[in-house]
Structure formats: C-alpha cells, structure tokens
Amino acid sequence: VPGEAEQPAPELVEVEVGSTALLKCGLSQSQGNLSHVDWFSVHKEKRTLIFRVRQGQGQSEPGEYEQRLSLQDRGATLALTQVTPQDERIFLCQGKRPRSQEYRIQLRVYKAPEEPNIQVNPLGIPVNSKEPEEVATCVGRNGYPIPQVIWYKNGRPLKEEKNRVHIQSSQTVESSGLYTLQSILKAQLVKEDKDAQFYCELNYRLPSGNHMKESREVTVPVFYPTEKVWLEVEPVGMLKEGDRVEIRCLADGNPPPHFSISKQNPSTREAEEETTNDNGVLVLEPARKEHSGRYECQAWNLDTMISLLSEPQELLVNYVSDVRVSPAAPERQEGSSLTLTCEAESSQDLEFQWLREETDQVLERGPVLQLHDLKREAGGGYRCVASVPSIPGLNRTQLVKLAIFGPPWMAFKERKVWVKENMVLNLSCEASGHPRPTISWNVNGTASEQDQDPQRVLSTLNVLVTPELLETGVECTASNDLGKNTSILFLELVNLTTLTPDSNTTTGLSTSTASPHTRANSTSTERKLPEPESRG
C-alpha cells in the first residue's frame, strides 16, 4: 500500500518441540480492541485464519490447529500446545476496531538431537591408502533445526584438509519433521593414529541457548607394515630344566605377520625351523639343556612376501647333571671309616650337601662326607644334593646306601600272639644285617621271604594253630655269615572274655614296622589285644 510504513520485525518466540507456545498479541489499545481479534498462520506467504476472538471468547477454525489452540491472559495470549517442527512459521493477530492493525510473531521451534551414535570402521584402515578412508560414521537423530557436527581426534577438532581429512554430512527429514544428521569422517591415517581417540560432537540450539552432545570415544584399527621383529622368552630370568618355556615372535606391524622360529644347529651352524603351536609360540615343556642355543625369528608379509629377521637370542636352560657318588655301594666293618665323594656338572656354580636319608639331617656342606668309627646304626641311606643357589629349585640328588657288616638283628625278641584253635595263623618276622640274613622257622608251614632292602628281610609263615603249636610256640631264626639270632612268638588262646567289642578275632601278627636299626626290645607299632584276665 503506497505510503504504508515498512513492517516491523516480528516478535521472536522460541519453544521446544512438544511444549506449549504462548503467542501474546502485542497490539496496543490504540491499535485495536483485543476483545475482537483474528489470528492467522502464515506459511509460504499464504495466510490462514486459525482462531477468532469475539467479546473475549475464543473459537478455533477448522484445520490443523483446531485441537491445539486456547486463549489465556484474559484473551491477550493464544496458547499453542504440542508444538511440532511444522509450527515454525509466522503467526499474526489482527485487531478489527477501530481500524485494522496486525502484530506478527515468529515462532522458532527447537529439539535437542539424540545422543550421537558413532560407529567405527570395523575393517580398519591401512596407512598406505591412496586417498582418505572412511574412519567412522556419526548419526544424530531427531533434532531440530539441523544440528552441526564437529569431529575430534585426541580432543582437537578436525578441519577439512585436502587429501588428508574429508567430512561428508547429509540430513534426512523424518515424518515428524525432525532432522537426522549423518556424517562420515574420511582421513588418511598414520601409524601413530593406532591409539588416537575419535569422537563426534553435535552442536544445537535450544531456547535456553547453545548446547552440545558428544559421542563415545572410539579407536580405529590401523594397519601398518612391520618394521621390526623380536623374540620374547617367558618366564623372564634364569631358566632351568623342567620349566615350561615359551618363545614367541613379536612384531611392530598390524596385523602381525606370519612368523617362523628357528634354532641354530650347533654342529652345522644352520638355522633349523622349530615347530610352533597354533598361536606361533614355541613351547619347550619340559625344557632340557639341549634346548639351549641361538634362536631367531623370521616374519613374512604374505602380501609382499618381504621377510624380516629378528636379532638372534641366546637361550640358556640351566641344568644339573646326574649326581655321581663314590663309592656307589659302600660296605664297611664296625669301627672303620668311610669317605663319600659327590660329583656333578652344571651350567652354573654348584653347592653340595650331604643329608641322612632317614632324618633329613644335614651332615655336611660340601661334596665330601667323612664318616669315622662307624657303628651299626650308621648303616642306611646318605643323600647328596647338588644345587644351584642362584636358581631356586634347580638341584639333583643321589642316594647311597651304606652297609655295616654284622650278624642279624631281630625286629623283636619275643612277642605274644592271640589265636584261636584251628585258625590259620599268619606270622611274620623281620631281621636285618649285612650280608642280608635269611630266615627259617622251627615249625612246618608255608613260608615266604621278602627283601625289604639290601640289609633287611621279612619272612611270613602261614600255619594252622594246633594244641602242639600252642604248647611249643614258634621261633624264627635269622642267620648270615657273621652269626644268627632268634625271635620267639608265644601263642595264647583267645577267650571270649578277653575280647573287646572292637577287637578282631582273627588277628594274627601284623608286619612289624621296626627298622633294621631298631633295638631288639623296641616296641612294635601294631595294635595289641588286651592282656587276659587273671583266673583265680
């Protein structure tokens, strides 16, 4: 209209999706009577009547706003509920009297996008790619208006960089009118990026101001060629025979190349390939001294067939050889002396110890054990232990049995055995001496002899209990070149009154556990039946 003043800028009303917009008609009393107002929405420069106010009473017009409009503030404000992105437009109120004036309101709608969803390239990126490769994608769903995306690497924003960094973004409009932003980061990566942390950030605006949401941080699988190959041995430190040793090949490339482990043959000086397990690890179990030697690893890039060799690594499996004792089977007269000498080889310095077998008592620290004025009790086992003090658990031992010449010793001199008439009795008798004795019985029966050790013998006799046997008892006699000795077994009939509830009526004599060095009057460790009651 000629001469009409330029329209003032509309009032800005900002509101979040889903909430209520309060559209206040800003007409002054001079411009119009608020009890008689028409409200319009303007879309693509087309006005549509949406609401009428007459005498302060409101009435919605049929259409998209019919159910969402109401009057507030004594008719000065129009409330629009459940705001959607499609409501972002100009609304105007027009007063009818005294003359037609209008007031314009620009409704701005906002919605925060969902948390950005980042997905990393699941196949990884080679460092030698010819152009920027897809690193990760970022999706920000259901925002309004379109959020802005910023990509970060190690906390620093990434900028477009020709042939190095390219960010490609697009948006789609959902049926709700909200935007989904999709962005893909393409970059040329270097080996150092294997640990780089990438994330995307969405920047958006709300009525309350500017905001941002960050995705989780991701690392990208980066592929780079192997430059260095090396061997690693577990366990670290000194190795000993019997250990489980693992030799593995390591490389600084990703993915790891194909490996083979070789050992230098000491005679030919040629490298011979060793058999590794499925993981490419050479397992030596148990490790032996023959495993000592020079190992190296070869790595192949199967694409280029270029191979790399590791620095050789010397492996030392420490050992102690079999221990030798001389004399190996010593025999001595009572009162004489004996020198026992122990020898062994090792990859390390050795320490020797002599121990008494029966008691584990340390007799000597050193390879030589001197024994003087030998008594019969000195017979038995002596153990030489050769050990490497610097490697706990690395030791070998050798046992030597010293025999002292002497007539037989009996495990017991006499013993009472409870029997029942007509039972088959199992009797045993033990004796020791050097030379080893033989045992004979003074009654007929089935006898069997068992050698317990070079100086000790156990004889067992099965015999039927007869009245004569009860009368005479049983004797066992042990004899060798140097003499003889006898043990007596007295047989006593078992009365019912002599039995206790837990006693065994068929008990014979259990094998004595007395050692060859036990005195003849030593107590037996077998369970004895109670003494018979006295009969008056």
Partner: antibody
C-alpha cells in the same frame, strides 16, 4: 534405483579358481563400498571380502591366501577371485552394498549359486 | 573373532503374535548390530541397523533393542509375510553373522 547383480560360473571343479563379477547401478563405487558374502546351502551367511569406496581391500582371514577383490569403477564392476576351490565352497555368493553412512549392507544382489564338484 | 549366537534357532508362531529373537555377542559391540530378514531363494534385507534404528521402508512393527552383548529383534504383531529366517550381524570388528532364526507358521 540401486541394483547389484552377480555373474560367473555355476559349476567349478575342485582346485580350480572361481571368478565372480558384481555389476552395480544406481550408485558409484567411489561413494559406497561393496562386500562379498556367501551362504552354503541351509547354512548361515559368511562375509568373505570387501572393497571400500577409496579402493582399500579387506579379506576374511579364514580365506585370505585364496582371495582377491578388485574393481573397475568405469565399468561399475567388482570382481572376486577365489583360488583352490573345494566342495565345501559350494554356496550362494552375494555382493552387497555398504550403506554410505554406516557399516551394514543396505542393498544386496540376488546371489549366484556356485557348485564345486568334479 | 567376535561370535554371534542367536536364540532360538527356530520358532513357531501365529499371525498376530508378538515375537522376540535374541542375539548374543561374544564381547561388547556397543550398538554395532544389524538385523536382516531372508526368505527362501532371496537375498537378505536389512530391517534394523545400529541396534535400534529402523531402516527406511520397513514396517514399524519391527523394532530392535539392546547394546553391549545382548540384543533383541521384536515383531509386535506377526503378519503372513514375516515368516522367514532372521539374521543378526555385528559390524564392530569385522563382520560376523548369527546362525539364523527360522520363524515358521504354527
């Protein structure tokens, strides 16, 4: 619209080499990566190989030494070769487009059944 | 390699039923998971990506949920055309598919 179509022999002999071609239309191979996925009769899907929009090639490590994937952008074709074929390689072979802003497959070819038999 | 295990391997249901199919990853894959539908003699078709986003053109009766190692595909009200085999696929590290769940008419 986006289409992918596999072509190649339906029958190969053991120890022979299989060559399959995937011809695409409706998109550019420099915008979307393409993968090959196979499915033995009555079995599950198995990813074989991929070529990215930038031309980087990727292989399933189970077949790596037998596979080669390449592309001819001017012909809109992706070629898969698989050497030393075995009867266990009998399957329907699909080529599939990787979605431009994600890592899943949004369009697939109809597949081609390859039988390995002497 | 990441293993994907689907359960059940087969399932009988009727039109109108609500159906859930589960997929378990052998390690955390965040939400790097897609669901596909395959009918006999046809190529797979993507239904869900990023664990819970519905692919354009797929009916809203299909929905996906879960993150980390446990995921679910739900069909809220089975339609006759939904009887097919369903596969989950991870794209967190390489690509691996589940063994499939065959959905049959009861």
């Amino acid at each position: 619209q986006v289409t992918l179509k596999e072509s190649g022999p339906v029958l190969v002999k053991p120890t022979e080499t299989l060559t399959l071609t995937c011809t695409v239309s409706g998109f550019s191979l420099t915008s979307n990566g393409v993968s090959w996925v196979r499915q033995p009769p009555g079995k599950a899907l198995e990813w074989i190989a991929a070529i990215s929009s930038g031309g980087t090639t990727y292989y399933n490590s189970a077949f790596k030494s037998r596979l080669s994937i390449s592309r001819d952008t001017s012909k809109s074709q992706v070629v898969l070769t698989m050497t030393n074929m075995d009867p266990v390689d009998t399957a329907t072979y699909y080529c599939a487009r990787r979605y431009g802003y994600g890592w899943y497959f949004d369009f697939w070819g109809q597949g081609t059944l390859v039988t390995v038999s002497s | 390699d990441i293993q994907m295990t689907q359960s059940p391997s087969s399932l009988s249901a009727s039109v109108g039923d609500r159906v859930t199919i589960n997929c378990k990853a052998s390690q955390n894959i965040y939400n790097s998971l897609a669901w596909y539908q395959q009918k006999p003699g046809k190529a797979p078709k993507v239904l869900i990506f990023n664990a819970n986003s519905l692919q354009t053109g797929i009916p809203s009766r299909f929905s996906g949920s879960g993150s980390g190692t446990d995921f679910t595909l739900t069909i809220s009200s089975l339609q006759p055309e939904d009887f097919a085999t369903y596969y989950c696929q991870q794209f967190y590290s390489g690509y691996t598919f589940g063994q499939g769940t065959k959905l049959e008419i009861k």
